[in-house]
Amino acid sequence: ISCGSPPPILNGRISYYSTPIAVGTVIRYSCSGTFRLIGEKSLLCITKDKVDGTWDKPAPKCEYFNKYSSCPEPIVPGGYKIRGSTPYRHGDSVTFACKTNFSMNGNKSVWCQANNMWGPTRLPTCVSVFPLECPALPMIHNGHHTSENVGSIAPGLSVTYSCESGYLLVGEKIINCLSSGKWSAVPPTCEE
C-alpha cells in the first residue's frame, strides 16, 4: 500500500521522499525565506481501507510574510493553551488542550495568518463530556460577570464577578460550574 505524490506547495519545498511512498511515511513542508507556513507541516501516509494509501490531512500553505500582521488572543472555552504566547505575529502558532472532562473537536493548532485571523481551520472547541450544564448566572447590581454566553454553561467552566468603581464585592469572586450541573456558590453582591 502506498500514497501518491504529496500535494505540491507554492513558494515552499517538500522534504525528500522515495517512491513508492510507503504507508507510515512522513513528509514535511517548509517555506522560502520571505514566506510563512500556515498549517500542519507534517503529512502522514495512512490507509483507511487497507487497500489505498492517502495523506492524513491537507497540505499547508506558504503566505508572503506580512510584518504588520498580528492576531488577537485566541480563546477556547473549556480549553487552555499548551503552546504559543503573545504577541502573535504572522506564522506564529497556538496549540490548545481541553480541561479535564472536556473533549476536543477540530484541530488543536491554529496559525496567525496574513489577514490577522487564525487559520487555516477554525479554533477547536472543547465540549463537556457531561450532559449536565449549569443554568445561566444573573448579572448583579453595580457589577459585571465574565460569562460570554447568556445560556447554560458547561461543567468545568467558571464565571468571574467584579464590581463597578466605588463598590465592594461581597461573596465569591469566581464561581465554578460543577459536574453535577450546580454552581459552586451563589452570586456575590456589590455593596457601597
Partner: antibody
C-alpha cells in the same frame, strides 16, 4: 511529560530472539509514534524502526528489515520490539523513544534495556 | 540513508568557556535536525529541535544554528553538568544519528 518504562535486561544465545517491551503512561498512547533506537557498547545511536499505534503501522530501517518486528498493544499502552536471529553484534542497550505528532524528534525516552548475546 | 557526520569526535574545553560542536549532513535536510545530550548510563535528552528551537526546560546557554547541510550546537558558558556526549539527528528522510561528540573537561 510521557513516561516510558522498559522491560528488564536479557541474556540470549546466538540465533535466538528477544522481545523488549515499552509501557507508556501519560498522554494519549495512540496519538504518537514510538521508535526503537539501539546503542552498542561505546558506540553511537542507531534507529531501528517505529510504530504509530493508532494506525498499527510499523516502518523499519533497511538494515533491520526482515529481522525486527515492532508491534503495539493500545489496550495496555505498550510497544514491543522483537529482534530475531540474534548475533553477538546485537549486544546493545535498546531504547524506546516517543515522537509527538510526526515531529521527527524524540521528547521522551525509556530507561533502556540491555540485551547481551553470548554463547 | 542520509549520513550524518559530527566533528570533532572529542572536544576538550574548560568550564566557563564556550563549546562549538559541528554536524554535517550528506545531503540537504532543510532545518530538520535535533541535538541530544547523553550522560553515561542514561538515555539521551532532547536539547534542540528544528535546528534552533530549544526544547522545554533546556537552559539558554544551549543554542543551535544552521540549515541545509551544516549545523552547529553552541554551549555559551560550560557548566560541570554539560560534560557529556552530544548527538545530532536528522528527520528529513526517516531518521539517522551522527556518531557523537564527546565533550570533556580540559
Amino acid at each position: 511529560q510521557v513516561q516510558l518504562v522498559q522491560s528488564g535486561a536479557e541474556v540470549k544465545k546466538p540465533g535466538s530472539s528477544v522481545k523488549v517491551s515499552c509501557k507508556a503512561s501519560g498522554g494519549t498512547f495512540s496519538s504518537y509514534a514510538i521508535s526503537w533506537v539501539r546503542q552498542a557498547p561505546g558506540q553511537g545511536l542507531e534507529w531501528m524502526g517505529r510504530i504509530i499505534p493508532i494506525l498499527g503501522i510499523a516502518n523499519y530501517a533497511q538494515k533491520f528489515q526482515g529481522r525486527v518486528t515492532i508491534t503495539a498493544d493500545k489496550s495496555t499502552s505498550t510497544a514491543y520490539m522483537e529482534l530475531s536471529s540474534l548475533r553477538s553484534e546485537d549486544t546493545a542497550v535498546y531504547y524506546c523513544a516517543r515522537e509527538d505528532d510526526s515531529s521527527g524528534y524524540y521528547q521522551d525516552w525509556g530507561q533502556g534495556t540491555l540485551v547481551t548475546v553470548s554463547s | 540513508e542520509i549520513v550524518m557526520t559530527q566533528s570533532p569526535a572529542t572536544l576538550s574545553v574548560s568550564p566557563g568557556e564556550r563549546a562549538t560542536l559541528s554536524c554535517r549532513a550528506g545531503q540537504s535536510i532543510n532545518s530538520y535536525l535535533a541535538w541530544y545530550q547523553q550522560k553515561p548510563g542514561q538515555a539521551p535528552r532532547l536539547l534542540i529541535y528544528d535546528a534552533s528551537t530549544r526544547a522545554t526546560g533546556i537552559p539558554a546557554r544551549f543554542s543551535g544554528s544552521g540549515s541545509g547541510t551544516e549545523f552547529t550546537l553552541t554551549i555559551s558558558s560550560l557548566q560541570s553538568e554539560d560534560f557529556a556526549v552530544y548527538y545530532c539527528q536528522q528527520y528529513e528522510y526517516w531518521y539517522t544519528f551522527g556518531q557523537g561528540t564527546k565533550l570533556e573537561i580540559k
